[in-house]
Protein backbone atom coordinates (compact mmCIF):
# COMPACT_ATOMS: atom_id res chain seq x y z
CA UNK A 1 0.00 0.00 0.00
CA UNK A 2 1.39 3.73 -0.81
CA UNK A 3 2.56 4.67 2.54
CA UNK A 4 1.56 8.24 3.53
CA UNK A 5 2.00 10.95 6.15
CA UNK A 6 -0.47 12.00 8.95
CA UNK A 7 -3.26 14.22 7.84
CA UNK A 8 -3.00 18.01 8.77
CA UNK A 9 -5.03 20.08 10.78
CA UNK A 10 -7.22 22.82 9.23
CA UNK A 11 -8.31 25.61 11.33
CA UNK A 12 -9.68 28.88 10.62
CA UNK A 13 -8.31 31.52 12.23
CA UNK A 14 -10.70 33.18 14.72
CA UNK A 15 -13.58 32.35 12.93
CA UNK A 16 -15.11 30.37 9.96
CA UNK A 17 -17.94 32.60 9.34
CA UNK A 18 -16.30 35.16 7.19
CA UNK A 19 -18.02 38.89 6.35
CA UNK A 20 -18.21 39.45 2.58
CA UNK A 21 -15.19 41.29 1.20
CA UNK A 22 -12.94 40.45 3.96
CA UNK A 23 -10.50 38.67 4.24
CA UNK A 24 -10.52 34.69 5.70
CA UNK A 25 -7.38 33.19 7.19
CA UNK A 26 -7.03 29.33 6.95
CA UNK A 27 -4.12 27.72 9.03
CA UNK A 28 -3.01 23.99 7.69
CA UNK A 29 -1.16 22.83 10.69
CA UNK A 30 1.50 19.67 9.29
CA UNK A 31 4.87 18.76 10.64
CA UNK A 32 8.37 20.42 11.08
CA UNK A 33 9.91 19.78 7.32
CA UNK A 34 7.08 19.92 5.06
CA UNK A 35 8.10 21.72 2.39
CA UNK A 36 4.97 22.34 0.57
CA UNK A 37 1.30 22.60 1.21
CA UNK A 38 -1.67 22.90 -0.85
CA UNK A 39 -4.99 24.22 0.03
CA UNK A 40 -8.19 22.36 -1.75
CA UNK A 41 -11.51 23.87 -2.58
CA UNK A 42 -14.12 21.73 -3.42
CA UNK A 43 -11.76 18.87 -4.42
CA UNK A 44 -9.68 21.40 -6.56
CA UNK A 45 -6.49 22.84 -5.95
CA UNK A 46 -6.89 26.38 -4.39
CA UNK A 47 -3.42 27.62 -3.37
CA UNK A 48 0.01 26.04 -2.38
CA UNK A 49 2.18 27.95 0.60
CA UNK A 50 6.16 27.22 0.94
CA UNK A 51 7.00 27.59 4.10
CA UNK A 52 10.81 28.96 4.46
CA UNK A 53 12.94 27.50 6.18
CA UNK A 54 10.68 24.38 6.19
CA UNK A 55 11.84 22.56 8.93
CA UNK A 56 11.41 25.27 11.01
CA UNK A 57 7.68 25.67 10.81
CA UNK A 58 4.94 22.86 11.55
CA UNK A 59 2.19 24.68 9.18
CA UNK A 60 1.25 27.35 6.70
CA UNK A 61 -1.76 30.14 6.98
CA UNK A 62 -3.58 30.45 3.74
CA UNK A 63 -4.72 34.23 2.99
CA UNK A 64 -8.27 34.33 1.14
CA UNK A 65 -8.88 37.86 0.49
CA UNK A 66 -12.27 39.50 -0.41
CA UNK A 67 -14.81 37.01 0.70
CA UNK A 68 -17.59 36.08 -1.36
CA UNK A 69 -19.26 33.18 -2.16
CA UNK A 70 -17.86 31.66 -4.92
CA UNK A 71 -15.09 31.53 -2.09
CA UNK A 72 -17.45 29.95 0.32
CA UNK A 73 -17.99 26.39 0.94
CA UNK A 74 -15.64 23.58 1.91
CA UNK A 75 -11.83 23.84 2.21
CA UNK A 76 -8.88 20.89 3.02
CA UNK A 77 -5.11 20.83 3.12
CA UNK A 78 -2.60 18.37 2.11
CA UNK A 79 1.52 18.72 3.00
CA UNK A 80 4.61 17.26 1.37
CA UNK A 81 7.64 16.27 3.13
CA UNK A 82 9.83 15.19 0.25
CA UNK A 83 7.98 13.30 -2.08
CA UNK A 84 6.00 11.96 0.23
CA UNK A 85 2.18 13.17 0.65
CA UNK A 86 0.17 13.36 3.44
CA UNK A 87 -3.65 12.09 3.98
CA UNK A 88 -5.76 14.81 3.40
CA UNK A 89 -6.95 17.21 5.95
CA UNK A 90 -10.62 16.62 7.61
CA UNK A 91 -13.18 19.10 5.37
CA UNK A 92 -13.30 22.80 6.66
CA UNK A 93 -16.94 24.60 6.12
CA UNK A 94 -15.85 28.79 5.46
CA UNK A 95 -19.15 30.54 5.27
CA UNK A 96 -19.42 34.08 3.84
CA UNK A 97 -21.92 36.10 6.13
CA UNK A 98 -23.25 39.94 5.84
CA UNK A 99 -25.40 38.70 2.24
CA UNK A 100 -28.35 40.52 1.64
CA UNK A 101 -30.46 41.55 4.95
CA UNK A 102 -30.62 41.30 8.91
CA UNK A 103 -33.03 38.72 10.37
CA UNK A 104 -34.40 39.57 13.86
CA UNK A 105 -35.01 36.98 16.76
CA UNK A 106 -36.88 36.64 19.58
CA UNK A 107 -37.08 34.15 22.56
CA UNK A 108 -40.38 32.93 23.92
CA UNK A 109 -41.92 33.29 26.81
CA UNK A 110 -39.14 35.65 27.33
CA UNK A 111 -34.99 36.56 28.27
CA UNK A 112 -35.37 35.95 31.74
CA UNK A 113 -36.71 32.34 31.96
CA UNK A 114 -36.46 29.82 35.34
CA UNK A 115 -35.24 26.66 35.09
CA UNK A 116 -37.07 23.96 33.34
CA UNK A 117 -39.26 26.46 31.45
CA UNK A 118 -39.21 25.39 27.68
CA UNK A 119 -37.76 27.79 25.37
CA UNK A 120 -38.26 28.36 21.38
CA UNK A 121 -36.09 30.90 19.52
CA UNK A 122 -37.92 32.71 16.45
CA UNK A 123 -35.92 33.69 13.82
CA UNK A 124 -37.38 35.89 11.06
CA UNK A 125 -36.06 36.90 7.45
CA UNK A 126 -38.27 38.47 4.83
CA UNK A 127 -36.14 38.20 1.81
CA UNK A 128 -36.53 34.84 0.27
CA UNK A 129 -34.65 32.16 1.95
CA UNK A 130 -35.64 28.61 3.81
CA UNK A 131 -33.50 27.98 6.07
CA UNK A 132 -32.25 29.32 9.41
CA UNK A 133 -29.79 29.24 12.08
CA UNK A 134 -29.38 29.80 15.79
CA UNK A 135 -25.90 30.11 17.32
CA UNK A 136 -24.82 30.55 20.92
CA UNK A 137 -22.30 32.98 20.94
CA UNK A 138 -18.50 30.86 21.98
CA UNK A 139 -20.28 27.39 21.27
CA UNK A 140 -19.99 28.74 16.53
CA UNK A 141 -19.81 25.14 15.73
CA UNK A 142 -22.99 24.27 17.58
CA UNK A 143 -25.41 25.53 15.00
CA UNK A 144 -28.89 24.72 14.85
CA UNK A 145 -30.94 24.61 11.56
CA UNK A 146 -34.31 24.88 11.18
CA UNK A 147 -36.38 25.61 7.96
CA UNK A 148 -39.43 28.22 7.04
CA UNK A 149 -40.66 30.36 4.41
CA UNK A 150 -39.90 33.80 6.44
CA UNK A 151 -39.19 32.78 9.98
CA UNK A 152 -38.43 29.40 11.87
CA UNK A 153 -38.65 28.21 15.13
CA UNK A 154 -36.05 26.69 17.36
CA UNK A 155 -37.32 24.77 20.22
CA UNK A 156 -34.90 24.53 23.25
CA UNK A 157 -36.51 21.98 25.70
CA UNK A 158 -36.53 22.49 29.49
CA UNK A 159 -33.31 25.09 29.70
CA UNK A 160 -30.99 24.55 32.09
CA UNK A 161 -28.48 27.08 33.11
CA UNK A 162 -26.14 25.76 31.14
CA UNK A 163 -28.63 27.27 28.23
CA UNK A 164 -27.91 31.03 29.51
CA UNK A 165 -25.61 33.24 27.14
CA UNK A 166 -26.20 35.08 23.64
CA UNK A 167 -28.03 33.81 20.57
CA UNK A 168 -27.95 35.13 17.09
CA UNK A 169 -29.84 33.53 14.01
CA UNK A 170 -28.66 34.30 10.67
CA UNK A 171 -30.90 33.55 7.22
CA UNK A 172 -28.99 31.23 4.98
CA UNK A 173 -29.39 31.51 0.80
CA UNK A 174 -27.15 28.03 0.76
CA UNK A 175 -25.51 26.13 3.32
CA UNK A 176 -22.46 28.41 2.98
CA UNK A 177 -23.96 31.76 2.52
CA UNK A 178 -25.35 33.55 4.96
CA UNK A 179 -27.43 36.64 5.95
CA UNK A 180 -25.86 39.24 8.12
CA UNK A 181 -26.68 38.28 11.59
CA UNK A 182 -29.24 39.37 13.82
CA UNK A 183 -29.25 41.07 17.08
CA UNK A 184 -28.05 39.26 19.92
CA UNK A 185 -30.72 37.83 22.54
CA UNK A 186 -29.14 36.89 25.53
CA UNK A 187 -31.03 34.32 27.52
CA UNK A 188 -30.43 34.69 31.15
CA UNK A 189 -32.03 31.61 32.85
CA UNK A 190 -32.52 31.49 37.00
CA UNK A 191 -33.00 28.63 39.14
CA UNK A 192 -31.06 25.10 39.07
CA UNK A 193 -29.28 26.54 41.57
CA UNK A 194 -27.44 22.65 42.28
CA UNK A 195 -25.78 23.32 38.90
CA UNK A 196 -24.68 27.36 39.34
CA UNK A 197 -21.52 27.19 39.92
CA UNK A 198 -20.76 24.41 36.76
CA UNK A 199 -22.88 26.84 34.45
CA UNK A 200 -20.81 28.43 31.87
CA UNK A 201 -20.52 32.36 31.58
CA UNK A 202 -20.35 33.99 28.52
CA UNK A 203 -17.49 33.42 27.08
CA UNK A 204 -15.59 36.83 25.51
CA UNK A 205 -13.46 35.01 23.57
CA UNK A 206 -13.59 33.38 19.91
CA UNK A 207 -13.72 29.66 20.31
CA UNK A 208 -10.59 27.92 21.59
CA UNK A 209 -10.75 25.57 17.98
CA UNK A 210 -10.82 28.69 16.01
CA UNK A 211 -7.37 29.45 16.87
CA UNK A 212 -4.48 28.97 14.68
CA UNK A 213 -1.43 27.25 17.00
CA UNK A 214 1.64 26.89 14.30
CA UNK A 215 4.62 26.80 15.86
CA UNK A 216 8.53 27.04 14.97
CA UNK A 217 10.80 24.82 15.73
CA UNK A 218 13.33 25.80 18.55
CA UNK A 219 16.97 24.58 20.02
CA UNK A 220 14.65 23.02 22.99
CA UNK A 221 12.67 21.22 20.22
CA UNK A 222 15.41 20.11 18.63
CA UNK A 223 16.92 18.56 21.51
CA UNK A 224 14.07 17.24 22.52
CA UNK A 225 13.47 15.39 19.24
CA UNK A 226 16.64 14.03 19.00
CA UNK A 227 16.03 12.69 22.93
CA UNK A 228 12.81 10.87 22.05
CA UNK A 229 14.59 9.15 18.47
CA UNK A 230 17.26 7.72 20.90
CA UNK A 231 14.96 6.68 23.40
CA UNK A 232 13.09 4.90 20.83
CA UNK A 233 16.09 3.06 19.82
CA UNK A 234 17.20 1.89 23.20
CA UNK A 235 13.64 0.80 23.69
CA UNK A 236 14.34 -1.30 20.59
CA UNK B 1 -47.98 50.20 36.44
CA UNK B 2 -48.91 47.81 33.47
CA UNK B 3 -51.82 47.99 31.68
CA UNK B 4 -53.71 46.57 28.71
CA UNK B 5 -56.74 48.62 27.66
CA UNK B 6 -59.17 47.11 25.23
CA UNK B 7 -62.84 48.69 23.98
CA UNK B 8 -65.75 47.66 25.94
CA UNK B 9 -67.24 45.82 23.11
CA UNK B 10 -67.80 45.78 19.05
CA UNK B 11 -70.66 45.19 16.85
CA UNK B 12 -70.19 44.00 13.18
CA UNK B 13 -72.34 42.31 10.69
CA UNK B 14 -71.71 38.91 9.59
CA UNK B 15 -68.80 38.38 6.46
CA UNK B 16 -67.00 42.03 7.51
CA UNK B 17 -64.26 42.51 8.84
CA UNK B 18 -63.28 43.95 12.54
CA UNK B 19 -60.05 44.95 14.04
CA UNK B 20 -59.45 45.13 18.12
CA UNK B 21 -57.19 47.07 19.30
CA UNK B 22 -55.03 46.80 22.90
CA UNK B 23 -53.33 49.55 24.16
CA UNK B 24 -50.14 49.00 26.63
CA UNK B 25 -48.86 51.32 28.98
CA UNK B 26 -46.49 50.88 32.09
CA UNK B 27 -43.84 49.25 30.34
CA UNK B 28 -41.44 49.13 27.59
CA UNK B 29 -43.71 47.88 24.63
CA UNK B 30 -41.12 46.75 22.18
CA UNK B 31 -39.83 44.07 24.78
CA UNK B 32 -42.27 41.87 25.57
CA UNK B 33 -44.60 39.51 23.67
CA UNK B 34 -48.18 40.52 22.77
CA UNK B 35 -51.03 37.42 22.72
CA UNK B 36 -54.36 37.40 22.31
CA UNK B 37 -57.35 34.69 23.67
CA UNK B 38 -60.57 33.68 22.90
CA UNK B 39 -63.53 33.21 25.06
CA UNK B 40 -67.22 32.54 23.78
CA UNK B 41 -70.02 32.77 26.14
CA UNK B 42 -69.69 30.06 28.88
CA UNK B 43 -66.88 28.49 27.76
CA UNK B 44 -62.85 27.89 28.32
CA UNK B 45 -60.50 29.83 27.23
CA UNK B 46 -58.55 29.83 23.43
CA UNK B 47 -55.68 30.96 22.25
CA UNK B 48 -55.41 32.36 19.14
CA UNK B 49 -51.87 33.89 18.15
CA UNK B 50 -48.73 36.01 19.57
CA UNK B 51 -46.76 38.94 18.42
CA UNK B 52 -43.55 40.40 19.20
CA UNK B 53 -43.59 44.08 18.93
CA UNK B 54 -39.91 44.54 18.36
CA UNK B 55 -39.33 41.77 15.48
CA UNK B 56 -42.83 41.45 14.06
CA UNK B 57 -42.26 37.69 14.42
CA UNK B 58 -46.26 35.92 14.76
CA UNK B 59 -47.31 32.50 15.85
CA UNK B 60 -50.25 31.67 15.41
CA UNK B 61 -52.60 28.89 16.32
CA UNK B 62 -53.70 26.78 13.06
CA UNK B 63 -57.17 27.32 13.77
CA UNK B 64 -57.10 31.06 13.90
CA UNK B 65 -54.18 31.15 10.87
CA UNK B 66 -56.62 32.38 7.92
CA UNK B 67 -58.78 34.23 9.71
CA UNK B 68 -56.97 36.57 12.61
CA UNK B 69 -53.88 38.52 11.50
CA UNK B 70 -51.77 40.27 14.22
CA UNK B 71 -49.96 44.12 13.74
CA UNK B 72 -48.45 46.17 16.08
CA UNK B 73 -48.08 49.89 15.78
CA UNK B 74 -45.06 50.75 17.91
CA UNK B 75 -45.65 54.53 17.97
CA UNK B 76 -48.97 54.66 19.54
CA UNK B 77 -48.20 51.13 22.15
CA UNK B 78 -50.61 49.30 20.36
CA UNK B 79 -51.23 45.85 19.12
CA UNK B 80 -54.67 44.75 17.09
CA UNK B 81 -56.00 42.04 15.68
CA UNK B 82 -58.40 42.01 12.60
CA UNK B 83 -60.61 39.39 11.98
CA UNK B 84 -62.37 38.71 8.93
CA UNK B 85 -64.98 37.14 7.17
CA UNK B 86 -66.95 37.46 10.75
CA UNK B 87 -69.79 34.63 11.58
CA UNK B 88 -71.63 33.87 15.28
CA UNK B 89 -69.31 31.36 16.00
CA UNK B 90 -66.56 34.52 16.46
CA UNK B 91 -69.25 36.22 18.95
CA UNK B 92 -66.77 35.69 21.58
CA UNK B 93 -64.71 38.05 24.68
CA UNK B 94 -61.14 38.68 22.79
CA UNK B 95 -58.25 39.27 25.63
CA UNK B 96 -54.94 40.51 24.84
CA UNK B 97 -52.10 39.39 27.40
CA UNK B 98 -48.70 40.22 28.00
CA UNK B 99 -45.64 38.33 27.45
CA UNK B 100 -45.10 34.77 26.98
CA UNK B 101 -45.78 34.18 30.29
CA UNK B 102 -49.64 35.88 30.14
CA UNK B 103 -48.50 38.15 33.09
CA UNK B 104 -50.85 40.82 32.65
CA UNK B 105 -54.26 40.75 31.00
CA UNK B 106 -56.70 43.04 29.12
CA UNK B 107 -60.46 43.55 30.41
CA UNK B 108 -61.47 41.94 27.48
CA UNK B 109 -63.12 43.24 24.11
CA UNK B 110 -67.12 41.81 23.45
CA UNK B 111 -67.41 41.28 20.04
CA UNK B 112 -71.27 40.37 18.97
CA UNK B 113 -71.49 39.10 15.38
CA UNK B 114 -75.17 39.63 14.43
CA UNK B 115 -76.85 41.04 11.47
CA UNK C 1 -51.61 20.08 20.26
CA UNK C 2 -51.00 19.36 23.89
CA UNK C 3 -53.78 18.81 25.70
CA UNK C 4 -54.63 20.05 29.22
CA UNK C 5 -56.84 17.89 30.88
CA UNK C 6 -57.93 19.89 34.04
CA UNK C 7 -60.02 18.15 37.40
CA UNK C 8 -62.38 18.31 38.84
CA UNK C 9 -64.83 20.47 36.61
CA UNK C 10 -66.69 22.12 39.64
CA UNK C 11 -65.97 22.18 43.10
CA UNK C 12 -67.95 22.79 46.12
CA UNK C 13 -65.91 23.67 49.61
CA UNK C 14 -66.45 25.37 52.54
CA UNK C 15 -64.42 28.57 53.70
CA UNK C 16 -60.93 27.40 55.58
CA UNK C 17 -61.09 24.54 53.36
CA UNK C 18 -57.84 22.84 51.77
CA UNK C 19 -58.22 22.52 47.98
CA UNK C 20 -56.40 21.27 45.24
CA UNK C 21 -56.95 21.46 41.52
CA UNK C 22 -55.32 19.50 38.76
CA UNK C 23 -54.24 19.72 35.47
CA UNK C 24 -52.83 16.88 33.58
CA UNK C 25 -50.34 17.57 30.35
CA UNK C 26 -50.54 15.32 27.38
CA UNK C 27 -46.76 16.03 26.14
CA UNK C 28 -43.77 17.18 28.19
CA UNK C 29 -44.45 20.87 29.09
CA UNK C 30 -41.42 21.19 31.71
CA UNK C 31 -42.39 23.83 34.21
CA UNK C 32 -44.21 25.90 31.40
CA UNK C 33 -47.26 25.92 33.43
CA UNK C 34 -49.42 29.18 34.39
CA UNK C 35 -52.61 29.28 37.00
CA UNK C 36 -54.77 31.81 35.97
CA UNK C 37 -57.94 33.37 37.96
CA UNK C 38 -61.32 34.42 36.36
CA UNK C 39 -63.71 36.64 38.47
CA UNK C 40 -67.45 36.56 37.33
CA UNK C 41 -67.15 40.37 35.44
CA UNK C 42 -64.56 38.69 33.36
CA UNK C 43 -61.65 39.86 34.56
CA UNK C 44 -58.67 37.32 34.15
CA UNK C 45 -55.31 37.33 36.86
CA UNK C 46 -52.34 35.06 36.77
CA UNK C 47 -51.64 33.25 39.88
CA UNK C 48 -48.91 31.38 39.76
CA UNK C 49 -46.18 30.88 36.61
CA UNK C 50 -43.71 28.21 36.06
CA UNK C 51 -45.17 25.86 37.82
CA UNK C 52 -44.74 26.82 41.29
CA UNK C 53 -43.94 30.66 41.14
CA UNK C 54 -46.29 32.83 43.02
CA UNK C 55 -47.06 36.01 41.42
CA UNK C 56 -46.56 39.53 43.66
CA UNK C 57 -49.62 40.65 45.21
CA UNK C 58 -51.15 37.11 45.27
CA UNK C 59 -52.02 35.53 48.56
CA UNK C 60 -49.77 32.89 50.08
CA UNK C 61 -52.62 30.58 50.44
CA UNK C 62 -51.99 29.90 46.95
CA UNK C 63 -49.08 27.43 45.78
CA UNK C 64 -48.93 25.33 42.98
CA UNK C 65 -46.71 22.25 42.57
CA UNK C 66 -46.25 19.57 39.87
CA UNK C 67 -45.65 15.52 40.03
CA UNK C 68 -44.54 14.50 36.71
CA UNK C 69 -47.24 15.47 34.28
CA UNK C 70 -49.15 16.74 36.87
CA UNK C 71 -49.81 19.65 37.96
CA UNK C 72 -51.53 21.26 41.28
CA UNK C 73 -53.17 24.92 42.45
CA UNK C 74 -53.49 24.15 45.68
CA UNK C 75 -55.41 26.98 48.27
CA UNK C 76 -54.28 25.94 52.40
CA UNK C 77 -57.36 27.99 53.31
CA UNK C 78 -60.40 29.24 51.01
CA UNK C 79 -61.48 32.96 51.57
CA UNK C 80 -64.91 33.92 50.27
CA UNK C 81 -63.41 36.01 47.33
CA UNK C 82 -61.77 32.55 45.52
CA UNK C 83 -64.92 31.13 44.84
CA UNK C 84 -64.68 31.57 41.25
CA UNK C 85 -62.95 30.18 38.04
CA UNK C 86 -59.72 28.86 37.34
CA UNK C 87 -57.74 27.91 34.25
CA UNK C 88 -54.33 25.86 33.93
CA UNK C 89 -52.45 27.34 30.82
CA UNK C 90 -49.48 25.69 29.29
CA UNK C 91 -47.09 27.85 27.35
CA UNK C 92 -44.27 25.57 26.50
CA UNK C 93 -45.05 24.67 23.15
CA UNK C 94 -47.46 26.31 20.29
CA UNK C 95 -50.13 26.14 20.20
CA UNK C 96 -50.42 26.94 23.61
CA UNK C 97 -53.42 25.37 25.63
CA UNK C 98 -55.70 25.92 28.67
CA UNK C 99 -57.48 23.59 30.81
CA UNK C 100 -61.30 23.36 30.45
CA UNK C 101 -61.48 25.21 33.73
CA UNK C 102 -62.85 24.51 37.45
CA UNK C 103 -65.56 26.65 38.52
CA UNK C 104 -64.78 26.62 42.67
CA UNK C 105 -68.29 26.92 44.56
CA UNK C 106 -69.29 27.70 48.51
CA UNK C 107 -70.99 24.81 50.05
Known amino acids: PKQTLPKPIIRAESTYMVPKEKQATLCCQGSYGAVEYQLHFEGSLFAVERPKPPERINGVKFHIPDMNSRKAGRYSCIYRVGELWSERSDLLDLVVTEMYDTPTLSVHPGPEVTSGEKVTFYCRLDTATSMFLLLKEGRSRDVQRSYGKVQAEFPMGPVTTAHRGSYRCFGSYNNYAWSFPSEPVKLLVTGDIENTSLAPTDPTFPDSWDTCLLTRETGLQKDLALWDHTAQNLLR | QVQLQQPGAELVKPGASVKLSCKAS????????MNWVKQRPGQGLEWIGM????????NYNEKFKSQATLTVDKSSSTAYMQLSSLTSEDSAVYYCARHGRFDYWGQGTTLTVSS | DIQMTQSPSSLSASLGERVTLTCRAS??????LNWLQQEPDGTIKRLIYATSSLDSGVPKRFSGSRSGSDYSLTISSLESEDFVDYYC?????????FGSGTKLEIK
Open chain 3, 27 to 32: QDIGSS
Open chain 2, 51 to 58: IHPNSDIT
Open chain 3, 89 to 97: LQYASSPFT
Open chain 2, 26 to 33: GYTFTSYW
